[in-house]
């Protein structure tokens, strides 16, 4: 058993049928010695008396808010949560496996640039009695500061019969140098509490590996005189790290016909302009990626050819 | 073809091309090593990210773009020096061009060159003959060092008579290649910045 925060305790249970559970001793936080009784949650049933209460915690019916009373007045509370260990592996009932970029990915994180700011998000089908808290640091043995904001419900989607909820959080490394070579990964730890179930999820990454630039901006087409060709130009997104000659992007450009089946001709360039043949009803698209480190491509920015 | 992009003319800055080759070679060699050593802890998540140049060179700090000099987090051990020399600086007049930066890159390359050669000598004694560095990566390092044209005392190649632990040597190779790829990215960024200056 360990203390999550004041008066909230997590009992770690080896979770299998007929498991013996864990013996827990609760102590009433009071100078009083006599006439103390204990109850669990809203039930008025007296579980025991005395300054301490010894319980065997085996299942969720044994978890909850234990209160010690004297003369009808509550003296102190202890909330017991359960953390299930199933065959050596902590349970992951609350969050959905996003399976990207690999199986067992519960937290996904992205950064738009090298400033040390990043966003993480996760999915669940649970809609009520759910709280999250997030901590983050650079490295774990001698952690350097990362400050995370409040967790927000960022999206709701219908998936078949189920509703899926996306939560996200923004974090900022306290003293980040965009040009630094990362040696220690960023660690993100999310505590999830659903009713009386406690779970924790972690993700470890280098900012360089989670970079996903915003799409290029100001995408423009300029027809060339006496030619079927068009000069297209675009700019680095505002959110990308500067100077751009140091934090350079590379671009993938394509012309997509009206039909999705039509062969797309893709080309790669480090420049911010190109000459293309842009037929009517087609569209021109461009996406960006760090020129020197192959992290994610941005989403496409598109304009119609006509 | 629907698309065409004009190819740039020859780079004004002679080291840019070499640094691009360096990054390609570093990335390819790392990728190949990860495939060959798939049963060894060789992924970014599994290795310790060591830096053999730590406390010996200060490439990131010495080569900071001017725009980032205002960022206090970037200035931990910044030593600024604006003396210019070395052949890559030919006829370029910008305050960013510091000998310290290019000298630091040169020293990095020299250190990695020695480490890679030492490691290769060990790996060539492995009866499994599982992996060794091809000449490409060593050649590319050499080319950039020549283009930088700094002179420095030669570092003797470490040689050991006792039989190496090949498992440890292969893991060390992974660590080295990951670190070298990261440093190659920095070098390429620096050269690109210098080229634009």
């Amino acid at each position: 058993i360990w203390e999550l925060k004041k008066d909230v305790y997590v009992v770690e249970l080896d979770w299998y049928p007929d498991a013996p559970g864990e013996m827990v001793v609760l102590t009433c936080d009071t100078p009083e010695e006599d006439g103390i009784t204990w109850t669990l949650d809203q039930s008025g049933e007296v579980l025991g008396s005395g300054k301490t209460l010894t319980i065997q915690v085996k299942e969720f019916g044994d978890a909850g808010q234990y209160t010690c009373h004297k003369g009808g007045e509550a003296l102190s509370h202890s909330l017991l949560l359960l953390h299930k260990k199933e065959d050596g592996i902590w349970s992951t009932d609350v969050l959905k496996d996003q399976k990207e970029p690999k199986n067992k990915t519960f937290l996904r994180c992205e950064a738009k640039n090298y400033s040390g700011r990043f966003t993480c998000w996760w999915l669940t089908t649970i809609s009520t009695d759910l709280t999250f808290s997030v901590k983050s640091s650079r490295g774990s043995s001698n952690p350097q500061g990362v400050t995370c904001g409040a967790v927000t419900l960022s999206a709701e989607r219908v998936r078949g019969d189920n509703k899926e909820y996306e939560y996200s959080v923004e974090c900022q490394e306290d003293s980040a140098c965009p040009a630094a070579e990362e040696r220690l990964p960023i660690e993100v730890m999310v505590d999830a509490i659903h009713k009386l179930k406690y779970e924790n999820y972690t993700s470890s990454f280098f900012i360089r590996d989670i970079i996903k630039p915003d799409p290029p901006k100001n995408l423009q087409l300029k027809p060339l005189k006496n030619s079927r060709q068009v000069e297209v130009s675009w700019e680095y997104p505002d959110t990308w790290s500067t100077p751009h000659s140091y934090f350079s992007l590379t671009f993938c450009i394509q012309v997509q016909g009206k039909s999705k089946r039509e062969k797309k001709d893709r080309i790669f360039t480090d420049k911010t302009s190109a000459t293309v043949i842009c037929r009517k009803n087609a569209s021109f698209s461009v996406q960006a990626q760090d020129r020197y480190y192959s992290s994610s491509w941005s989403e496409w920015a598109s304009v119609p050819c006509s | 073809r629907n698309l065409s992009v004009a190819t740039p003319g020859p780079e004004m800055f002679p080291c840019l091309h070499h640094s691009q080759n360096l990054l390609k070679a570093a990335s390819n060699t790392l990728q190949k090593a990860r495939q060959i050593l798939e049963f060894y802890p060789c992924t970014s998540e599994e290795i310790d990210h060591e830096d053999i140049t730590k406390d010996k060179t200060s490439t990131v700090e010495a080569c900071l773009p001017l725009e980032l000099i205002k960022n206090e987090s970037c200035l931990n051990s910044r030593e600024t020096s604006f003396i210019t020399n070395g052949s890559c600086l030919a006829s370029r007049k910008t305050s960013f061009m510091m000998a310290l930066c290019l000298r630091s890159i040169y020293e990095d390359l020299k250190m990695y060159q020695v480490e890679f050669k030492t490691m290769n000598a060990k790996l060539l004694r492995d009866p499994k003959r599982q992996i060794f560095l091809d000449q490409n990566i060593l050649g590319v390092i050499d080319e950039l060092m020549q283009a930088l044209n700094f002179n420095s005392e030669t570092v003797p190649q470490k040689s050991s008579l006792e039989e190496p632990d090949f498992y440890k040597t292969k893991i060390k190779l992974c660590i080295l290649l990951h670190a070298f790829r990261i440093r190659a990215v920095t070098i390429d960024r620096v050269m690109s910045y210098l080229n634009a200056s």
């Epitope: 080896d14 007929d18 498991a19 592996i89 009932d93 089908t125 | 802890p41």
Partner: antibody, heavy 115, light 112 residues
Framework: QVQLVESGGGVVQPGRSLRLSCAAS????????MHWVRQAPGKGLEWVAF????????YYADSVKGRFTISRDNSKNTLYLQMNSLRAEDTAVYYC????????WGQGTMVTVSS | QSVLTQPPSVSGAPGQRVTISCSGS????????VKWYQQLPGTAPKLLIY???QRPSGVPDRFSGSKSGTSASLAITGLQAEDEADYYC????????????FGTGTKVTVLG
């Protein structure tokens, strides 16, 4: 004490279907994940499928994906395995088992797929 | 086919010590715990070892488990006639959990 009893096995022709049941008793069935494991005659153990305590997530071995469906009825304390498009290589003893460090196995039910 | 490799058979005289190895990789045994089962002919598997080296109550202390890196092993000391059975190791893969990974199985024969 914990008890698991499989039923529903038998002889079936290739391409046909069969539904296995596993009746659980002696524990809070709705709190624990459950597996199906099979063993072909003279061969080793092969995991088939898993279902979470609340039925929210199901996992399958590649060899049965798309043909077999694991399900549970927590009100009846019963685990099921619906087997469609059966093949000769599905011939085996099928066991249900609890998920956890100390697991409990049923006695097994024999499924024979033969023409 | 199984990704946890065991020797097909081991044998020993009564009273001897035999060991069965179970070889995996970094993503399974290297990052998860190992169980060992004993299966007597015509019966369901019986748990012998969990969490690499822990014995459930009722399992004789002649059976012991260990794990090192990407391999695990089961040792039976003071071999007895009733130990003649098939033995299986089991673990998980970090990317496919909760799928159970079983070893190929080892037949233990008690000589004489």
């Amino acid at each position: 004490q914990v008890q698991l009893v499989e039923s529903g096995g038998g002889v079936v022709q290739p391409g046909r279907s069969l539904r296995l049941s596993c009746a659980a008793s002696g524990f809070t069935f709705s709190s624990y994940g459950m597996h199906w494991v099979r063993q072909a005659p003279g061969k080793g153990l092969e995991w088939v499928a898993f279902i979470r305590y609340d039925g929210s997530n199901k996992y399958y071995a590649d060899s049965v994906k798309g043909r077999f469906t694991i399900s549970r009825d927590n009100s009846k304390n019963t685990l099921y395995l619906q087997m469609n498009s059966l093949r000769a290589e599905d011939t085996a003893v099928y066991y249900c088992k609890t998920h956890g460090s100390h697991d409990n196995w049923g006695q097994g039910t024999m499924v024979t797929v033969s023409s | 086919q199984s990704v946890l490799t065991q020797p097909p058979s081991v044998s020993g005289a009564p009273g001897q010590r035999v060991t069965i190895s179970c070889s995996g990789s970094r993503s399974n045994i290297g990052s998860n715990t190992v169980k060992w089962y004993q299966q007597l002919p015509g019966t369901a598997p019986k748990l012998l070892i969990y969490y690499n080296d822990q014995r459930p109550s009722g399992v004789p202390d002649r059976f012991s488990g260990s794990k090192s890196g990407t391999s695990a092993s089961l040792a039976i000391t003071g071999l007895q006639a009733e130990d003649e059975a098939d033995y299986y190791c089991q673990s998980y893969d970090r990317y496919t959990h909760p799928a159970l990974l079983f070893g190929t199985g080892t037949k233990v024969t008690v000589l004489g």
